[in-house]
Every structure is written in C-alpha cells, then in structure tokens.
Amino acid sequence: EDELQVIQPEKSVSVAAGESATLRCAMTSLIPVGPIMWFRGAGAGRELIYNQKEGHFPRVTTVSELTKRNNLDFSISISNITPADAGTYYCVKFRKGSPDDVEFKSGAGTELSVRAKPSAPVVSGPAVRATPEHTVSFTCESHGFSPRDITLKWFKNGNELSDFQTNVDPAGDSVSYSIHSTARVVLTRGDVHSQVICEIAHITLQGDPLRGTANLSEAIRVPPTLEVTQQPMRAENQANVTCQVSNFYPRGLQLTWLENGNVSRTETASTLIENKDGTYNWMSWLLVNTCAHRDDVVLTCQVEHDGQQAVSKSYALEISAHQKEHGSDITHEAALAPTAPL
C-alpha cells in the first residue's frame, strides 16, 4: 500500500462570526491504524481542538461517521465561531502506540479567518461647548471587527469632511480590531440643527454601512446679542425699557436689570421664542418710575448665558423737567460696574 497521506484541501476558510466552520481533512489509507486529532497552531503550544479517541468537544461535530470501518473523511465542523477561533488548524494522524499513540503525519493546515462585524460606531463630542468660528473635535470608535480592512468617513449635514485622522489597532495580526477616528469641525452660527455622522464600511456589512451620529447642538454655544430700547411712555411718570436677547443657544439664561449699578430685578428666561436655526430669542422689560429719580438713570441689562461670563448693555434714561423721551445706549461686555451717566 502507498503510505498514508493527510489531505487538507483548503489552504484557507473564511467564516462569519456566529456561524459554523467546516475544516476538511481526508486520509488516503486506513493504515497505519490510529486516531486523528485536530489542533490549532503548531509546535509545543498547539491547542487540541478534537481528539477522535477521547475527550469532550461540545462545539465540534464530525462531518462523517468516524466509526465506520472504511471512513477516510475526518472533516470537522466547529459551531458558533468567534474571532478568538481564528488561526491555522492542522489535521494530524496518529499511529497506535503503547502506552501512547505516536504522531504519524500532519496535514498542511487550513487557515481559519473570522469575519466579525464592527460594533455600532459611538460618536462623542467635546466635553465643553464652543462658540461659532471655533474648531471642535469629534471622535468615533468601533470595535471587534475582522478582517482589518475597514473604511471610515465623516459627514456634516451630508457633506463629507476631510479634516480627520483615523487609526486601526492593533497594527499587527490580531483576532479582531478596533478603529478610532477624530474629526475637526469648524462651528458656524447655524449649527444648532447640524449633525455629524461617522460612517463605517466593512466586508461583513454587505454594502450597508454602520453609522454613528452626534448633534452639534451638544457642542455649540451661540452667545446672545442684546438690544436695549425705550418704548413709548405708558404714563407721564413712567418709562418702559426693554432688553431684547437674540439668537442664543442653549436655553439657559439669566437676566439682571441694574439701575445705576444697583440690582433692580433678576429673572430666569422661561418662555422663549425659537428661531428657525434653533437659536432662541427672549425679551425682558423694566418699568422705571421717573418721579423717584432727580438725575438721569443708567439702566443696564446684564445677561449670564450658559454659565459664561456675563454680557451687558446699558441705556441712559434722561430725567428732565419735561420728562423727555429720549436717551442713548451703552454696551458693556461683562461690565459689572455701574455705567457712568452720559
């Protein structure tokens, strides 16, 4: 008889995670008598996957009925494949021996690669908000995919971004890989409704990429603009002054009126008007009893937005014998000290 040969017909097999992998092996002879074993890897550190003679291998089933006298097919199927199962598998024929069987011949090996889907991309934005014209960074992470080849793209409102840096780890061979990408986005005033999307394409996704999103509303702060005006008089001894707070985001806003530097009233913005671009407007008014003032009054509208340093705008209300209805306004960025009268 010709000497027994161990034939592993496939050099490589690729299987999706969760599926079963069939590893084929055939002998050309029944002689010499002895069991076959399957190993992952070679050398002293090889891992026993299946032993025809003894042991319990719950994930392994034999393709043929190995106890048939004339069986020459020693293919196995491994169920519920994970990336950790990747490696080169060897079908090894042992020759009966006493007390122990002796390794007789090995197949050439079959490399099992596992196709594992990337996890859903997680996009995270900056820890603190930034104002328009500033650049913020968004990160995108996905894990557990194999093989290593992967494509990542960034979009802002459907437009592809180019300012990003991507790393796939580890650099060498691994059972699975992770991707990390950082994109730099320049904020604009209209970005409250904007969205950034991280899109990942991989062989396991069959042309249907995974997407992770982040809303720029979580990253942007649009500071308010202030306008203080005097409204027509309701009565001869009263002046109605309004503070229009416009185009701010997010909502959190506290307004304080000062008369000649002294706090008159503090209120928190409640009923806001939302603009089309997602920013908000709010108006506050102050009724001034002109009889209580001999001199001109400087009215200051001071706004603290989103925990930032206060901004203010002042208005000089003239007190005259004839209760004239005119004045001029003064703007102060974070001016907490009383405004000098005009």
């Epitope: 010499p32 008598v33 002895g34 069991p35 009925e65 004339n70 006493s98």
Partner: antibody, heavy 124, light 106 residues
Framework: QVQLQQWGAGLLKPSETLSLTCAVY????????WNWIRQPPGKGLEWIGE???????NYNPSLKSRVIISVDTSKNQFSLKLSSVTAADTAVYYC??????????????????WGQGTTVTVSA | SYELTQSPSVSVSPGQTASITCSGD?????YAWWYQQKPGQSPVLVI????KRPSGIPERFSGSNSGNTATLTISGTQAMDEADYYC?????????FGGGTKLTVL
C-alpha cells in the same frame, strides 16, 4: 455486557437461502457493529460481514454477491441471508458484537462477544 | 487480499510460557486481536488492540504487535488454556482471521 442469542434453520438443500437471526440483549444497540462469522467443520474462522445500527454494512469480498445482512433496531435484532447455498457453506455460524463506543476509530474494535453458534448443514 | 499466517500447533508444558505468533505484511501498523476457542464452544476474545486484556481474562495472557508479527504470550500455562487460538486484523473494512494455532498443554 451485551448477550447474543441466535437461531435459524439448521438443514438446507443446495441453492436454498440460509437465514439466521441474532437477538441482542443489554448494551446500547447504536454503539455496536454486528457481525456474522462462520467455521466449517475442522477448519478456521471466516468473517462474513457486519452491520451497524444505521444499516451501514461491510462484507467479505468472497461472499459479497450472496450475502445480505440487515438490522431491525425496533427489535434489537440483526439477520443474515446467504443465497444459493452449496455444501461448501456447511459450517457453524456465529453472530458477534463489536463495541466501538466514544473513543473508537476505524479498525480499533474487534469481536468482543459471540453468540452460541448455529450449525447449518447443506445437503441434498 | 490480506493474509495472516499462524503456525498450526504449539506445545508447552504446564507452568511454562507459550508464545503463539501471527504474521502479516506490516501487521504492526494494524491492531491485532486474539480469540480462544475450546472444542464445541464459541470463540472468546482474550486480547484486543494488540495488548489489552478484556475483563475476566487472566493476567497470564498478554499480547504485543510490531513490524510484521503479533504475538500472544501465555505465561504459566495451565491445562485449561489448551485450545485453538486465532489472530485477527482488519484490511479495507474486512476482518481477516489467521488459520489458527492449536495449543497443546503436555
């Protein structure tokens, strides 16, 4: 351990069909091959063939054209039919079990338990 | 077809060691079985897979198999060991028996 009890016609005329049955008691029917062996008077043992629970058979090439071995798992029995017998088929016929169990592989199991034997005579 | 050859007879004195041989091409690459048959009785398996003894078989029975020869050894042979002994191996899913050896205990 498995026990085997066999029966069948002991006297046949040439060209008739020999028919023997072997009943299996004890053991797991699905972990055995079931054999038939014969021994002509004053001679050595000759293997006829075997069958397992799923009906997989192997036959001695010299007898293959005349032999049918079948199995009835519902009764835990297996049978031998040898057609067109001649005087040369006169022998003691034995059934025997080959237990293969979980640690077995091809050609690692032999005939561990034998039936009591049935003498078959072919004579005109 | 594969053939196994046994010497027709072996004689041994009680208490002595009897060696019964079985030869076949590269028999050591196969498993050998040994069966004992006493007159008027069914064969009994005494050695399986070259050198293993079934339960109930006395320790004086032992086996070996290498090269082209399998050997059944009976140490301290007793009168009750007088019988025909058959070796058996498998070839291409066919059981092959040796011609048998008659052991006579003098």
């Amino acid at each position: 351990q498995v026990q085997l009890q066999q029966w069948g016609a002991g006297l046949l005329k040439p060209s008739e069909t020999l028919s023997l049955t072997c009943a299996v008691y004890g053991g797991s029917f699905s972990t055995y091959y079931w054999n038939w062996i014969r021994q002509p008077p004053g001679k050595g043992l000759e293997w006829i063939g075997e069958i397992n629970h799923s009906g997989s058979t192997n036959y001695n090439p010299s007898l293959k054209s005349r032999v049918i071995i079948s199995v009835d798992t519902s009764k835990n029995q297996f049978s031998l039919k040898l057609s067109s017998v001649t005087a040369a088929d006169t022998a003691v016929y034995y059934c025997a079990s080959s237990h293969y169990g979980s640690g077995s592989f091809p050609d690692s199991y032999g005939m561990d338990v034998w039936g009591q034997g049935t003498t078959v005579t072919v004579s005109a | 077809s594969y053939e196994l050859t046994q010497s027709p007879s072996v004689s041994v004195s009680p208490g002595q060691t009897a060696s019964i041989t079985c030869s076949g091409d590269k028999l050591g690459d196969r498993y050998a079985w040994w069966y004992q048959q006493k007159p008027g009785q069914s064969p009994v398996l005494v050695i399986y897979q070259d050198d293993k003894r079934p339960s109930g078989i006395p320790e004086r029975f032992s086996g070996s198999n290498s090269g082209n020869t399998a050997t059944l050894t009976i140490s301290g042979t007793q009168a009750m060991d007088e019988a025909d002994y058959y070796c058996q191996a498998w070839d291409s899913s066919t059981a092959v028996f040796g011609g048998g050896t008659k052991l006579t205990v003098l």
